[in-house]
Amino acid sequence: EICGPGIDIRNDYQQLKRLENCTVIEGYLHILLISKAEDYRSYRFPKLTVITEYLLLFRVAGLESLGDLFPNLTVIRGWKLFYNYALVIFEMTNLKDIGLYNLRNITRGAIRIEKNADLCYLSTVDWSLILDAVSNNYIVGNKPPKECGDLCPGTMEEKPMCEKTTINNEYNYRCWTTNRCQKMCPSTCGKRACTENNECCHPECLGSCSAPDNDTACVACRHYYYAGVCVPACPPNTYRFEGWRCVDRDFCANILSAESSDSEGFVIHDGECMQECPSGFIRNGSQSMYCIPCEGPCPKVCEEEKKTKTIDSVTSAQMLQGCTIFKGNLLINIRRGNNIASELENFMGLIEVVTGYVKIRHSHALVSLSFLKNLRLILGEEQLEGNYSFYVLDNQNLQQLWDWDHRNLTIKAGKMYFAFNPKLCVSEIYRMEEVTGTKGRQSKGDINTRNNGERASCESDVLHFTSTTTSKNRIIITWHRYRPPDYRDLISFTVYYKEAPFKNVTEYDGQDACGSNSWNMVDVDLPPNKDVEPGILLHGLKPWTQYAVYVKAVTLTMVENDHIRGAKSEILYIRTNASVPSIPLDVLSASNSSSQLIVKWNPPSLPNGNLSYYIVRWQRQPQDGYLYRHNYCSKDKIPIRKYADGTIDIEEVTENPKTEVCGGEKGPCCACPKTEAEKQAEKEEAEYRKVFENFLHNSIFVPRPE
């Protein structure tokens, strides 16, 4: 049975019975706010294998493990997320282990496991086997690992049953509980799932399967489920629904919208059954299930009840997907996130008009505002105190507003304010004044020339490349030595390069301040000889591949409060030389007569140039007599190597427990005082925790239905 469109179990643990027949929860699962400790042992939902959105657990007293509740939960798809997370376990007072021993895949989103005072077996789970990226997992404030003493099955008896993997350079056994190992598939399966007996599943399976290589035996589907089969795409005249299954037209026509009873019903568009037509399309008549292109831009008006919409995560941005006109104010406050620039563009990239003001503050994850790629008009019907309709404050990594050569943005009413944006050059702000028609509206203090751009090399000169030399996997480039007014201001150069099949890249492509950056960076020191031009050898490149390269001068950014000039080059496109192709693949030879061999092969995976011909060589080989010398069926003929395990028990040193080596001294002393940067990071961390907690509370505390 498919349950949905989301299940919220709260206050009464007996509500869990609603899950009794669910095999798939199409939507989210909340289990929360059950304050009376209960005995959950009689509750078991072995049928549940998939949650299509996210799983949230919050303040459920008495629940010690999720393994008994959901022994077969295999996949959380994360089609919609809870504040960027697909699994949230928060303030679960009695939870001792997660125990979801069959959980094999979280398709999208990260995990957040926080403030669970009794929760152990966290360091024994290798989340990289379950999620694509573990960098955004947030596992904080749980039982300290030293107090847990997590032991995987069999380790006490010195008969370890679980497999080992490396996490943070620690090679260790992986398990969910004291008696449940973390399942790993044989390396021969690659990205495929496997059965309990380690046989590889069909490529369309996700998580697990009951029989090998069979698309009807999957526990969950990698792409879509239709009529008992996992399929890579929905068959003709069936439609993608909720990101995981294919439905027919009748099904789509009969869905009642969970959001509102007066909605016009779902539509079918480009092979998907969806709640409403996407941006650029409109229903073909009010009763129609089909969308037609709008003549010109067709507005999708989105309105915020509270007038101001705060964008502080991917989840909050998700609410604006498809909106072209936003009635209200936008407050953007993005402190962190994975791949945040492209996620924000995905959800906010269609907004053309904001009727109120736009405020961007403390958005340290942003390098550019180009994710608002269609914003053309800020009406300023509502303004911030001081009559500001565009307000940019304290964005530590913001370097670019928009690409003004390709951008028309009008601010109809209101002023602009910029302060404490250390990497945002004032010239960029002045350019915005000109483009938006706000020049002359701002007073002197509205654009702070001291603290905007103080950590950037502004007023850039152009660096010119002087020579380029290529080989199959190297590029040597040199450029004119840059001479700022005072040569001491020039520190070094940074070379940025990346593969660029097309000549259409920009400096800020795919860049955010949280480490997502599509450019590789190399620092180049100044040549000691002032007459030698600086240059670099880029090596380890792919043959016959076009690269984009540009260079920036790294300069001291302030000299007695005057901005000094920086320098950077244009983007240069350069292709490495062709090289020897990789070996042809899948070489097969078969004899079809006593004097002929038929040899077949596939092209190499890396042609490294334009292939013109193949060379086939052969030679007669003598029969190898060595093959007959050993009886390979006899065990004693094969030497068995034994290795010392090299472990020695060392007692922990306990004297002077509160000491650290600090400064230049070698003796015990007080802990070093925290640096300003550390204090700032801690402050931001605490702030981020608060923001999440507020989001959680705002999402789950709702008035009782009357």
Epitope: P232, A233, C234, P235, P236, N237, T238, D248, R249, D250, A253, N254, D270, G271, Y290
Partner: antibody, heavy 114, light 107 residues
Framework: QVQLKESGPGLVAPSQSLSITCTVS????????VSWIRQPPGKGLEWLGV???????YYHSPLKSRLSITKDNSKSQVFLKMNSLQTDDTAMYYC????????WGQGTSVTVSS | DIVMTQSQKFMSTSVGDRVSVTCKAS??????VAWYQHKPGHSPKPLIY???YRYSGVPDRFTGSGSGTDFTLTINNVQSEDLAEYFC?????????FGAGTKLELK
């Protein structure tokens, strides 16, 4: 397994009506739709319309005024009725399982001639 | 209506050759395109759906590619049983439409 079979009159006089029956097995007409397609001699395939599991229909607009698709779920039969036939309606008429378009009948030949 | 144009009515080939049949849609149909093989006296046999996925039982010498408006059916190592007419079909928008067909014949 899934099967569809068309049965029709073969020959129809101009201005008369055409009735073809498509009998299906291996799937339920409550759950799945059936499409009708035709192919005039020497020409390509032309989609005529569909009846879905829930009985809704959609007709190709040039034929809308003279086309009707109905069904009898209990007998697993779908019916195509076309009025005012002309010689250019001469074609091979096929029914197909709409969802998937992966199962087609063998077709029934219809000639419009006096 | 979306027009599916198969510009070549006939294509000549030899057994063992590789042949590509093309189809162009008059507007974007994403990847909602299928290919059918049709032999005289038989019903059309589905080969490819969603532009590039084979229906079960279809030999892997048949491959489909393309998205948007341009689509290709490629037959590697043509066999004698592949000599037939090939139709493309869009199911992105109603009415569903088919190409005029491309007949594959021996040189």
């Amino acid at each position: 397994q899934v099967q569809l079979k068309e049965s029709g009159p073969g020959l129809v006089a101009p201005s008369q009506s055409l009735s073809i029956t498509c009998t299906v097995s291996g799937f339920s007409l409550n759950e799945y739709g059936v499409s009708w397609i035709r192919q005039p001699p020497g020409k390509g395939l032309e989609w005529l319309g569909v009846i879905w599991g829930g009985r809704d229909t959609y007709y190709h607009s040039p034929l809308k005024s003279r086309l009707s698709i109905t069904k009898d779920n209990s007998k697993s039969q779908v019916f195509l009725k076309m009025n005012s036939l002309q010689t250019d309606d001469t074609a091979m008429y096929y029914c197909a399982k709409h969802e998937g378009m992966d199962y087609w009948g063998q077709g029934t030949s219809v000639t419009v001639s006096s | 209506d979306i027009v599916m144009t198969q510009s070549q009515k006939f294509m000549s080939t030899s057994v063992g050759d590789r042949v590509s049949v093309t189809c162009k849609a008059s507007q974007n149909v994403v990847t909602n395109v299928a290919w059918y093989q049709h032999k005289p006296g038989h019903s059309p046999k589905p080969l490819i759906y969603s532009a590039s996925y084979r229906y079960s039982g279809v030999p892997d010498r048949f491959t489909g590619s393309g998205s948007g408006t341009d689509f290709t059916l490629t037959i590697n190592n043509v066999q004698s049983e592949d000599l037939a007419e090939y139709f493309c079909h869009q199911y992105n928008n109603f009415p569903l439409t088919f190409g005029a067909g491309t007949k594959l014949e021996l040189k």
